[in-house]
C-alpha cells in the first residue's frame, strides 16, 4: 500500500513500459523540506523490488547517481516479463530503531509488441445470427493490448468492434453484431484485425469470405418420425429447418450400436423416408443441414430423437429339442424345450408360444399356448408323433418349427463313434466324434446335449444343446459350463425317423475330490467280500470322477496296502473283492480319482472274513 507520495516522487526513464531485455533508470526524489528532520545529510534513499507483492531485492548497490539527502537514481536490468513494483524508502541512519519510511513507488511493465493476428475465422450461426470472428493472437504480450476487428463489404459497408487482452482476460473473439442476409450470397467481405499496445502495433493479413463461407445453419429442430401403417422397418423422419437449407445429412443407429447409418438428402424439405429399419429396436436419429450443395458448412448435429420402431411378426425358426421318458406301461412324457428367438428374429415382445403335438397316423392333435420356453405332456407310447412350436408377438406368429419325436438313443447303428470331451479352458469343453459306422439312413444333423451330473428338476433345469450340421464332427460347448462340475454329454445322430446316441462325461476344470466315498457296509457272500459305499456328495467331487480305489491292509501292519481300482459308474455302489485271508482283521477304505488326482481317504472300516481263502 503506497501513500499518495507525500514525501517525494519516483520517475522512470525511458518509460514505465519497456521491451523485454531493456534497462530502466528509476529516480527517487524527496520533496522540499522532507527527509530526516535534524540531519538532512543523513537521508538515505533505498529502492526495493517486489514481484507479486513479495520483496525480492534491495537495489542499494545499483545506484548510478546520488544527490546526498535529496535524490538517488538506480539502474534496473534483467526484468522479467510482466509487472514489477519498485518502492523507494527513506532510511534515517541516525535512528536505527525506526524502520525506513515509504516515499513513493512505481510499476514497470515488461512486455513485447503484438504479433500480427493470424488464422482469422468468421461464422454466422443461422440466417438470423450475427457475424462473429475469432483469431490467433500469437505470443502473449504481457501488456494491455487492444484489438480492433474491422469488416468491410459491398455498398461501403464498414463495421468495427474492439476488445483488449491483459493479465485477467484474453481477447481473441468479437461479435460484430451485424447480420449478413442471403441476398448478399455472392458478395465478398474483408475482415482485418489490428493489435496495438505501448510497445507497438501490427495488423493481420486481410481475410476474405462470402456469405456461404461463414453462415452455419442452425441445427434442425422438432424432429419426429412417423411409421407408415405402424411398420417396424419403414418410417418418415420429419423436422424443421431454416428456409435456405438445400442439403441434409441424416444419421441413425440402434442405441447399442457403434457405427452410424449415414444418408444425404437433397431438397428434402424437412422429410425423408427410411426403409431399412429394424423392427422393435431403440434408435437414435440426428440431422445436420447445409445451405449450399458444394460450398458452406454443415450445421451442428440436431438434438437426438430416440424412439423404438414398432413390432413386426417374428421371423426365423425356433431351435427345438425334447426329452422323452416312459412313465408307465403305455404312456410317455414328452418335454419340449426351445431357445428364445434373438431380438432381430423376435421383432417384438414374444407374448406366447403356440405348441402342437400331433400323432401322424391317427391325426390326434394336442395344442396349447405357453409363455415358458418348455412344455410337457403325457401321450401314448404308441404311434408316430411330431411336435411344432411357433412364437407370437402382438403382430403375428413365426412359421412353426417341426420336429419328429423319435427314440433318441434307440438305434445302435446311428450311434456316433469315438466321442471325446476335452477341457479347453475354465468355461468350455470341446466335444469331438466320428460318424456312425453302419447307419442305414443318412444323418440329417447331430445334436450335442449336456446336463450337469448333479440332481436337478426336469422342468426347472432344461437341457442345453447345440445343433450341428451333418458334415461337422465337433462342437465347443460353453453355455452354462462351470468349472469343477462334471457334465454328461450326449452326441445324437438323427435321421428322418430314427436316432442314435453316444455318451461321455467331461468337465472344463477339475481338482482332486474333497473326500473319498463313505463305506457303509462290508458283507461276506460265497467267500467274497462285498464293499458297499455312498457316493461323494456332488459339490465335493470337483470334476468328473474317473474311478474309485478300494484299499485294504492287515490291521497293525506297516506294509503298503493293496488296492483294487473300479471304473466309476454312478449306478454302482458296491464291489466284490476276493483276495483277503479268513480270520485276519483288515482295515479298508476308499478314495476317488479325477484327472487332477486322488482324494483323501474316506472312512476306515475293519472287517474279519470268516470264509475260506481263495
Amino acid at each position: 500500500n503506497i501513500d499518495v507520495c507525500k514525501l517525494g516522487t519516483v520517475t522512470v526513464q525511458p518509460a514505465p513500459v519497456i521491451p523485454l531485455g531493456s534497462a530502466a533508470n528509476i529516480s527517487c526524489s524527496l520533496n522540499p523540506k522532507q527527509g530526516c528532520s535534524h540531519y538532512p545529510s543523513s537521508n538515505e534513499l533505498i529502492l526495493l523490488k517486489f514481484v507479486n507483492d513479495v520483496l525480492v531485492e534491495n537495489l542499494h548497490g545499483k545506484k548510478v547517481h546520488d544527490h546526498t539527502g535529496h535524490s538517488s537514481t538506480f539502474q534496473v536490468t534483467n526484468l522479467s516479463l510482466g509487472m514489477t513494483l519498485f518502492v523507494c524508502k527513506l532510511n534515517c541512519s541516525n535512528s536505527q530503531k525506526k524502520p525506513p519510511v515509504p516515499v513513493c513507488g512505481v510499476e514497470i511493465s515488461v512486455g513485447v509488441a503484438p504479433e500480427p493476428p493470424q488464422n482469422i475465422s468468421c461464422v454466422q450461426e443461422g440466417e438470423n445470427g450475427t457475424v462473429a470472428c475469432s483469431w490467433n493472437s500469437g505470443k502473449v504480450t504481457y501488456l494491455k493490448t487492444n484489438y480492433t476487428l474491422q469488416l468491410s463489404g459491398p455498398n461501403n459497408l464498414t463495421c468495427q468492434k474492439q476488445c483488449f487482452s491483459d493479465n485477467r482476460q484474453n481477447c481473441n473473439r468479437l461479435d460484430l453484431g451485424i447480420n449478413l442476409s442471403p441476398d448478399l450470397a455472392e458478395s465478398r467481405f474483408i475482415v482485418r484485425v489490428t493489435a496495438i499496445n505501448d510497445l507497438g502495433n501490427s495488423s493481420s493479413l486481410p481475410h476474405t469470405f462470402t456469405f456461404l463461407d461463414i453462415v452455419i445453419p442452425l441445427p434442425p429442430w422438432d424432429i419426429r418420425i412417423n411409421f407408415l401403417n405402424a411398420s417396424g422397418s419403414r418410417g418418415t423422419l420429419q423436422w424443421e429447418d431454416e428456409g435456405q437449407v438445400v442439403l441434409n445429412q441424416l444419421r441413425y443407429q440402434p442405441l447399442n450400436s457403434t457405427s452410424w447409418n449415414m444418408v444425404n438428402a437433397t431438397n428434402a424439405k424437412g422429410k425423408y423416408d427410411l426403409r431399412d429399419l429394424r423392427p422393435f429396436t431403440e434408435y437414435e436419429f440426428q440431422i445436420s443441414s447445409k445451405l449450399h450443395l458444394s460450398g458452406g458448412s454443415w450445421s451442428n448435429w440436431s438434438e437426438s430423437l430416440r424412439t423404438r420402431t414398432p413390432e413386426e411378426e417374428p421371423v426365423g425358426i425356433l431351435d427345438i429339442w425334447y426329452m422323452k421318458q416312459d412313465i408307465d406301461y403305455d404312456r410317455q412324457q414328452i418335454s419340449l424345450f426351445w431357445k428364445s428367438l434373438n431380438p432381430s428374429e423376435a421383432r417384438g415382445k414374444i407374448l406366447h408360444y403356440q405348441v402342437t403335438l400331433q400323432e401322424v397316423t391317427k391325426k390326434t392333435t394336442l395344442q396349447n399356448t405357453t409363455r415358458h420356453t418348455s412344455w410337457t405332456r403325457v401321450i401314448p407310447r404308441t404311434g408316430a408323433w411330431t411336435a411344432s412350436v411357433s412364437a407370437a408377438n402382438s403382430k403375428g406368429a413365426s412359421a412353426p418349427t417341426h420336429i419328429n419325436i423319435v427314440d433318441l438313443c434307440g438305434t445302435g447303428l446311428l450311434a456316433p463313434h469315438q466321442v471325446s470331451a476335452k477341457s479347453e479352458n475354465m468355461d468350455n469343453i470341446l466335444v469331438t466324434w466320428q460318424p456312425p459306422k453302419k447307419a442305414d439312413s443318412a444323418v440329417r444333423e447331430y445334436i450335442v446335449e449336456w446336463r450337469a451330473l448333479q440332481p436337478g428338476s426336469i422342468t426347472k433345469f432344461p437341457p442345453h444343446w447345440l445343433r450341428i450340421p451333418p458334415d461337422n464332427m465337433s462342437a465347443l460347448i460353453s453355455e452354462n459350463i462351470k468349472p469343477y462340475i462334471c457334465y454328461e454329454i450326449r452326441v445324437h445322430a438323427l435321421s428322418e425317423s430314427q436316432g442314435g446316441c453316444s455318451s461321455i462325461r467331461g468337465d472344463s476344470k477339475h481338482k482332486a475330490p474333497v473326500s473319498g466315498p463313505h463305506i457303509t457296509a462290508i458283507t461276506e457272500k460265497k467267500e467274497r467280500l462285498f464293499i458297499s459305499w455312498t457316493h461323494i456328495p456332488f459339490p465335493e467331487q470337483r470334476g468328473c470322477i474317473l474311478h474309485y480305489r478300494i484299499y485294504w491292509k492287515e490291521r497293525d501292519s506297516t506294509a503298503q496296502p493293496e488296492l483294487c481300482e473300479i471304473q466309476y459308474r454312478r449306478s454302482q455302489n458296491s464291489h466284490p473283492i476276493s483276495s483277503l485271508q479268513p480270520r485276519v482283521t483288515y482295515v479298508l477304505w476308499m478314495t476317488a480319482v479325477t484327472a487332477a488326482g486322488e482324494s483323501p481317504q474316506g472312512n476306515e472300516r475293519e472287517f474279519c472274513p470268516q470264509g475260506k481263502a481263495n
Epitope: R451, G456, T459, R570
Partner: nanobody, 119 residues
Framework: QVQLQESGGGSVQAGDSLRLSCTAS????????MYWYRQAPGKQREFVAY???????NYLDSVNGRFTISRDNAKNSVYLQMNSLKPEDTAVYYC?????????????WGQGTQVTVSS
C-alpha cells in the same frame, strides 16, 4: 435321499370326493416334478397326474376334469383332489418324485394309500 409319505385315502361311495396328500422330506432341493400313480388289483401301475415346477399339470384322460393336482411349496406337499369318484378309481395311489442327474432319472416312491370306491 428323498422320502415321500401319502395320506388321505379311504373308502367312499361313488360320486364322493377325497383329497390325497403327499409330503416330501430329505434331499428335496431338486425335486420339482411330482406325480400321482395308481395300481388297481391285478393291473399294472398307471400314471394319474403330474405337476411341474412351473405349476403346469397334466392328467390321465379318464380322470381329466374330475381330479386336480396342486402343490404347496412351503409345506413340500402335493395334493390330489378327487371329485366324482367312480368304482374304477379304486386302487392304491402312490406319490412319485422324479429328478434328473445327467440323463438318468431317479425316482422316489411313497408307500401308497388305499382308495376304495363302492357303487
Amino acid at each position: 435321499q428323498v422320502q415321500l409319505q401319502e395320506s388321505g385315502g379311504g373308502s367312499v361311495q361313488a360320486g364322493d370326493s377325497l383329497r390325497l396328500s403327499c409330503t416330501a422330506s430329505g434331499s428335496i432341493f431338486a425335486i420339482d416334478d411330482m406325480y400321482w400313480y395308481r395300481q388297481a388289483p391285478g393291473k399294472q401301475r398307471e400314471f394319474v397326474a403330474y405337476i411341474t415346477a412351473t405349476n403346469s399339470a397334466n392328467y390321465l384322460d379318464s380322470v381329466n376334469g374330475r381330479f386336480t393336482i396342486s402343490r404347496d411349496n412351503a409345506k413340500n406337499s402335493v395334493y390330489l383332489q378327487m371329485n366324482s369318484l367312480k368304482p374304477e378309481d379304486t386302487a392304491v395311489y402312490y406319490c412319485n418324485a422324479k429328478q434328473i442327474v445327467g440323463f438318468q432319472i431317479d425316482e422316489y416312491w411313497g408307500q401308497g394309500t388305499q382308495v376304495t370306491v363302492s357303487s
